[in-house]
């Protein structure tokens, strides 16, 4: 016997209530998939959240994070603080890159400059706290 | 045991007002989630308005937004739709909701009462 609540498409649930009749999921829920017994509550995108993309009855609110913040982890499940190039995140806050790292975002860590001699090149251009060594030829 | 009682309902000539009534027992509306849902003729459920979030926000759908109004009266536990430049395609049995969050996540809605029949038709 097929299950009556497989005939409910997304954007509705299958109402124990009503003899299994697909009823509409109420506002601010949504179900992506047919045959639920119930809807999720839509994600709300407040504080340094903001709304990328709204909830509707068949899919959840999408956020980013406002600006001078980037999102971290699936979903944007986090806003982390955005820095300047040439620093990276501390629990301090935005840090200098020190001496012989550099990063080139406004996210991520420091990195050491590139080794130029590990291929036995030479350093064509000097590195800077936002940008890595330029190597060039070989001596 | 949760009730929901409508009133309010009738029949009216397009353009015109009707306000609906929901006296609710059982639970108190303001401390819940509560809405109208209606029913047109051969169709499935909608819902039409809600207010949400203990009050602080209100929903309506875009086929009444500007015509139709939701409000509530803590003191007499009763939820309240008034409806104005009615349509012939707002005719539907209206139904009282109260939104159910399960633990888990989930939401349903609850409609207990036997709705209230609006018919607008020249």
């Known amino acids: 016997l097929q299950d009556p609540c497989s005939n409910c498409p997304a954007g509705t649930f299958c109402d124990n209530n009503r003899n299994q009749i697909c009823s509409p999921c109420p506002p601010n829920s949504f179900s992506s998939a047919g045959g639920q017994r119930t809807c999720d509550i839509c994600r709300q995108c407040k504080g340094v959240f903001r709304t990328r993309k709204e909830c509707s009855s068949t899919s959840n609110a999408e956020c980013d994070c406002t600006p001078g913040f980037h999102c971290l982890g699936a979903g944007c499940s986090m806003c982390e603080q955005d820095c300047k190039q040439g620093q990276e995140l501390t629990k301090k806050g935005c840090k200098d890159c020190s001496f012989g790292t550099f990063n080139d975002q406004k996210r991520g860590i420091c990195r050491p400059w590139t080794d130029c001699s590990l291929d036995g090149k030479s350093v064509l251009v000097q590195g800077t706290k936002e940008r890595d060594v330029v190597c060039g030829p070989s001596p | 045991e949760v009730q929901l009682l409508e009133s309010g309902g009738g029949l009216v000539q397009p353009g015109g007002s009707l306000r609906l009534s929901c006296a609710a027992s059982?639970?108190?509306?303001?401390?819940?989630?509560v809405g109208w849902v209606r029913q047109a003729p051969g169709k499935g459920l909608e819902w039409v308005s809600a207010?949400?979030?203990?009050?602080?926000?209100?929903y309506y759908a875009e086929s009444v937004k500007g015509r139709f109004t939701i409000s509530r009266d803590n003191a007499k536990n009763t939820l309240y739709l008034q409806m104005s430049s009615l349509r012939a395609e707002d005719t539907a049995v209206y139904y009282c909701?109260?939104?159910?969050?399960?633990?888990?996540?989930?939401?349903?809605?609850?409609?207990r009462g036997q709705g209230t029949q609006v018919t607008v038709s020249s």
């Open positions: 059982g639970f108190t509306v303001s401390a819940e989630d």
């Open positions: 909701a109260r939104i159910v969050y399960h633990a888990g996540g989930g939401v349903t809605f609850d409609t």
């Open positions: 207010i949400l979030d203990k009050g602080g926000s209100t």
